[in-house]
């Protein structure tokens, strides 16, 4: 099985114990590590952070001790914006320029492939996204002709039904991608006005439309129905939780909220907590399991957080094995307890290790 793990370059800027550099990563933990994110400037793939080149080097030296490790560079992301991607992909010349710029950039910096993180193609971009993938793959095949190992091509796709329908021609893009990471998280957020888990494995007992689509099981089933080969589908598992501020004394699933949860001490983003921050939060919190959805949530005071733990990730891995998928994807290594100092287990990357162990179990 593949274990595809994202590392985010901006995690270097977190304070104190939250700061994560690629040299803190475990070279034997994942089969693939994806560095997020690269930029596109003047239609050429480019660095984003001032010290990206240094961090690329840090990441890729992990392969010195583990030659089986593959590294990919992810281009795009939330801050890049869909519009910019759209302009490049829809223009033949811009697209060609971008595609041509990718292999030398990846080779120069020691990457084994490219991950496309266009979040998200609009309805009018559907065909252009397919063309971009098809032409990128063709370029990778051509570039590898002189006996070089062919560069890998992957894409991170939304797990939301509406986005899947409007953005992707799954059957076509699957032919050209080496693997597809389905982002089976962020199904529920503060915009809903109630508490809810952002990455449930299954549908909740009370879920009516459209909530009945907001779970991992539905997203995976729908992707397969649309023609994604199970052998290329990698299922996303988050090492972060989504938090809410409760608006009343109700604390269960579906309780009213006044907004996102308070920012974490290190990640500093309202409504999001890294797993290592959740381990802190759990001291003195009440933990519940959403039985049907097979995921936990915790409450403390007026704070509510839905997250994944070692038990839920094992359930998710068993599920992806039952579905005969290619493996698991983790967002993100730097949100796991990468130092092993928060979750009281004397173990670095406890969630990702639990995923790895479950994948290896027979």
């Amino acid at each position: 099985y593949k274990l595809v793990c994202y590392y985010t370059s901006w995690s270097q800027y977190r304070e104190g114990d939250g700061s994560c550099f690629p040299d803190a990563l475990d070279r034997f933990l994942c089969t693939h590590i994806i560095y997020s994110f690269a930029n596109i400037s003047n239609d050429h793939i480019d660095t984003w952070e001032w010290n990206d080149v240094t961090l690329y080097g840090m990441l890729n030296t992990l392969k010195n001790r583990n030659p089986n490790l593959k590294t990919l560079l992810s281009v795009g992301g939330w801050n890049f914006g869909s519009q910019r991607f759209s302009k490049i992909a829809s223009n033949t010349q811009s697209r060609r320029t971008f595609i041509k710029s990718v292999p030398p950039f990846l080779r120069t910096h020691g990457f084994d492939g490219l991950d496309l993180a266009w979040l998200y193609p609009g309805r009018r971009d559907k065909q252009h996204f397919t063309t971009l993938i098809k032409e990128m793959k063709a370029e990778f095949i051509k570039e590898a002709q002189p006996g070089k190992k062919q560069l890998l091509l992957s894409a991170a796709l939304s797990a939301g039904k509406v986005t899947i329908d409007s953005s992707y021609d799954i059957a076509k893009i699957s032919q050209h991608l080496d693997f597809i990471s389905i982002m089976t998280y962020d199904f529920h957020g503060a915009w809903r006005g109630t508490t809810g888990h952002h990455s449930p494995l299954f549908r909740g007992q009370e879920d009516a439309s459209p909530d009945r689509f907001s779970n991992t099981d539905y997203a995976v089933g729908y992707m397969l129905r649309l023609g994604a080969p199970a052998s290329k589908l990698v299922m996303g598992i988050p090492t972060f939780g989504r938090s809410f501020t409760l608006a009343s004394s109700e604390t269960g699933v579906g309780a009213p909220i006044s907004g996102p949860g308070i920012p974490g001490r290190f990640t500093k983003e309202a409504g999001t907590l890294a797993y290592y921050e959740i381990c802190d939060f759990l001291r003195g919190a009440t933990v519940h399991r959403i039985l049907g959805q097979q995921v936990p949530y915790a409450t403390k005071g007026n704070q509510w957080v839905g997250y994944d733990d070692q038990e839920s990730v094992k359930s998710k891995v068993q599920y992806l094995k039952d579905r005969q998928l290619a493996g698991a994807m983790v967002w993100a290594l730097d949100l796991d307890d990468f130092q092993g100092s928060f979750c009281g287990q004397d173990l670095r990357f406890p969630l990702t290790n639990a995923i790895k162990d479950a994948l290896a179990a027979t």
């Epitope: 299954f202 129905r225 649309l226």
Partner: antibody, heavy 118, light 107 residues
Framework: EVKLLESGGGLVQPGGSLKLSCAAS????????MSWVRQAPGKGLEWIGE????????NYTPSLKDKFIISRDNAKNTLYLQMSKVRSEDTALYYC???????????WGQGTSVTVSS | DIQMTQSPASQSASLGESVTITCLAS??????LAWYQQKPGKSPQLLIY???SLADGVPSRFSGSGSGTKFSFKISSLQAEDFVSYYC?????????FGGGTKLEIK
């Protein structure tokens, strides 16, 4: 009210071809997956295949994939089943059905009968 | 392909009784199971989807349960119009496959 009306059935010789149609009304046809299901006389239901709204995905029962072609024309609100190389075991009542977003088929036509005989 | 084994093939029961039909999947299908009713000379009608969810307009005497590989369909108080055929269908992996059917007969 959603209505599905199949047509095009009849008597066809072994090895011959036939094209069935299913006209949909009462719904935004272009938003929905559509399916074909058949039922041989006195037998159970057999799923033939399905097509997604923009025709980019068509799934078939493997044993029928080389004989049957499913297509649709959203402008005409019509689903089609092109049958070829028919044999006596293809004698059945052919239903078109509309799967809901939960994949189960919540609307069915009345069926059109196909008899394969020389 | 996933095989669906439905039992019994036929069952006799009396008005007002309860009856249970079973469907076994050849591999796990989660809760991706539907139940249909078919009256003689009519097209099938969806009763249950997602193993346990009642389709719109279906009387509450019909219920579904189960997950994984074993599923049950229950009619709690049989009425005259219920003595017809019932089919299960898995929607976990294409090709979607049906069980062989169960014919309910009046005692």
């Amino acid at each position: 009210e959603v209505k599905l009306l199949e047509s095009g059935g009849g008597l066809v010789q072994p090895g011959g071809s036939l094209k069935l149609s299913c006209a949909a009304s009462g719904c935004d046809f272009s938003r929905y997956w559509m399916s074909w299901v058949r039922q041989a006389p006195g037998k159970g239901l057999e799923w033939i295949g399905e097509i997604n709204p923009d025709s980019s995905t068509i799934n078939y029962t493997p044993s029928l994939k080389d004989k049957f072609i499913i297509s649709r024309d959203n402008a005409k609100n019509t689903l089609y089943l092109q049958m070829s190389k028919v044999r006596s075991e293809d004698t059945a009542l052919y239903y078109c059905a509309r799967p809901e977003d939960h994949f189960a088929m919540d609307y069915w036509g009345q069926g059109t009968s196909v008899t394969v005989s020389s | 392909d996933i095989q669906m084994t439905q039992s019994p093939a036929s069952q006799s029961a009396s008005l007002g009784e309860s009856v249970t039909i079973t469907c076994l999947a050849s591999q796990t299908i989660g809760t991706w199971l539907a139940w249909y009713q078919q009256k003689p000379g009519k097209s099938p009608q969806l009763l249950i989807y997602a193993a346990t969810s009642l389709a719109d307009g279906v009387p509450s005497r019909f219920s579904g349960s189960g997950s994984g590989t074993k599923f049950s369909f229950k009619i709690s108080s049989l009425q005259a119009e219920d003595f017809v055929s019932y089919y299960c269908q898995q929607l976990y992996s294409t090709p979607w496959t049906f069980g062989g059917g169960t014919k309910l007969e009046i005692k």
